[in-house]
């Protein structure tokens, strides 16, 4: 008799999830000499242990602590780039500016980037059919709790000037409900972080507005200032030219505003 299975509203675990996590771990530790000591089988076991046999609406940050411990990594605290709703450009930027890091450039962030996973209470099976949706089902699901945990730790590690890339094409350029707005902003440490610098990325070619004056940016400035962190904001009018100038800063066209 087939066992009754909980049907969730979100997509199921990514196909070949265990193989992908293991392969990404091996790949990462091969490329980053400082992480060569990491045993990828242990990493997978700890990852699996965080959600297997547990109710996928009852996951806690505590469940991920063994994985966090194994994936402990020191990134230069003054070279951190946060982002909200503009992941591709953030990753293109750190691909060119190789001394800067997004969360997904760290081991734990890379392992989970763009993947979905969940298990089932009291069985060792991975659920490939469906997983809880944050809105429709529950917020304490394996994926959401993972990103909340690693995002908090990443923000806590930041120092000096922290940069954040924001999508100027969205109705809410700064969204209090995003991971950046709900987790990272509140976990920057005022005793370590001097300034949060926002880069507002323009979408339209002809868009010359100063999006740093947007009400949601003013809201971000207010939240940050109340936390005794300075705030600055820059418009990036031409993201293509911005990347080009990061790559070739000596180019004569790179002295003007981008």
């Amino acid at each position: 008799v087939p066992r009754w299975r909980q049907q969730w509203s979100g997509p199921g675990t990514t196909k070949r999830f265990p193989e992908t996590v293991l392969a990404r771990c091996v790949k990462y530790t091969e490329i980053h000499p400082e992480m060569r000591h990491v045993d990828c089988q242990s990493v997978w076991d700890a990852f699996k242990g965080a959600f297997i046999s547990k109710h996928p609406c009852n996951i806690t940050e505590e469940d991920y602590q063994p994985l966090m411990k194994l994936g402990t990594q020191t990134v230069p605290c003054n070279k951190i780039l946060l982002w909200s709703r503009i992941k591709d450009l953030a990753h293109q930027f750190t691909q060119v500016q190789r001394d800067m890091f997004t969360l997904e450039d760290t081991l734990l962030g890379y392992l989970a980037d763009d993947l979905t996973w969940c298990g089932e209470f009291n069985t060792s099976k991975i659920n490939y059919q469906s997983c809880p949706d944050w809105r429709k089902d529950c917020s304490n699901n394996p994926v959401s709790v993972f990103w909340k945990t690693v995002s908090r730790r990443f923000a806590e590690a930041a120092c000096d000037v922290v940069h954040v890339m924001l999508n100027g094409s969205r109705s809410k350029i700064f969204d209090k409900n995003s991971t950046f707005g709900s987790v990272e902003v509140h976990n920057l440490q005022p005793e370590k972080v001097q300034t949060l610098e926002a880069w507002v990325i323009h979408g339209g070619r002809e868009d010359s507005r100063d999006l740093c004056q947007d009400p949601t940016i003013k809201e971000l400035e207010s939240i940050i200032s109340k936390r005794n962190i300075q705030f600055s904001c820059k418009n990036i009018y031409r993201p293509d030219k911005f990347l080009q100038c990061v790559k070739n800063p000596e180019d004569s066209s790179c002295t003007s505003e981008i």
Partner: nanobody, 130 residues
Framework: QVQLVESGGGLVQPGGSLRLSCAAS????????IGWFRQAPGKEREGISC????????LYADSVKGRFTISRDNAKNTVYLQMNSLKPEDTAVYYC???????????????????????WGQGTQVTVSS
């Protein structure tokens, strides 16, 4: 909007050659790693090659090493896969994919991983048969 279009597939005899093209429209390939993947009937999609955005680093699966060559022409916004000494087991639908991820085309222990690539073309059929 990231859009990739593959072309150059077709029917070829064993030992023959084909050159696949992957053209990008609506965005520049300059800051994307490009991977080639293939899927044979009833099999998993497998990564066979990729080329990095910055330094032109290339990576090949063991199954195609020495026979296939990946290259890119950023001026034409196109990536190519030159396939020589084709075998019947190379028969598959070939897909190109783009990724901004730093590690999408790096290292030497693994061919490109599907999960590292977020934008995909529709695929082009390659059939190797006499």
């Amino acid at each position: 909007q990231v859009q990739l279009v593959e072309s150059g597939g077709g029917l070829v005899q064993p030992g023959g050659s084909l050159r696949l093209s992957c053209a990008a429209s609506g965005f520049s390939l300059d800051y994307y790693h490009i991977g080639w993947f293939r899927q044979a009937p009833g099999k998993e999609r497998e990564g066979i090659s990729c080329i990095s955005s910055s330094d032109g680093y290339t990576l090949y699966a063991d199954s195609v090493k020495g026979r296939f060559t990946i290259s890119r022409d950023n001026a034409k916004n196109t990536v190519y896969l030159q396939m020589n000494s084709l075998k019947p087991e190379d028969t598959a639908v070939y897909y190109c994919a783009a990724s901004p991820r730093r590690l999408a085309c790096a290292g030497s222990l693994y061919p490109p991983l599907s999960a590292d690539f977020s934008s995909w073309g529709q695929g082009t059929q390659v059939t190797v048969s006499s």
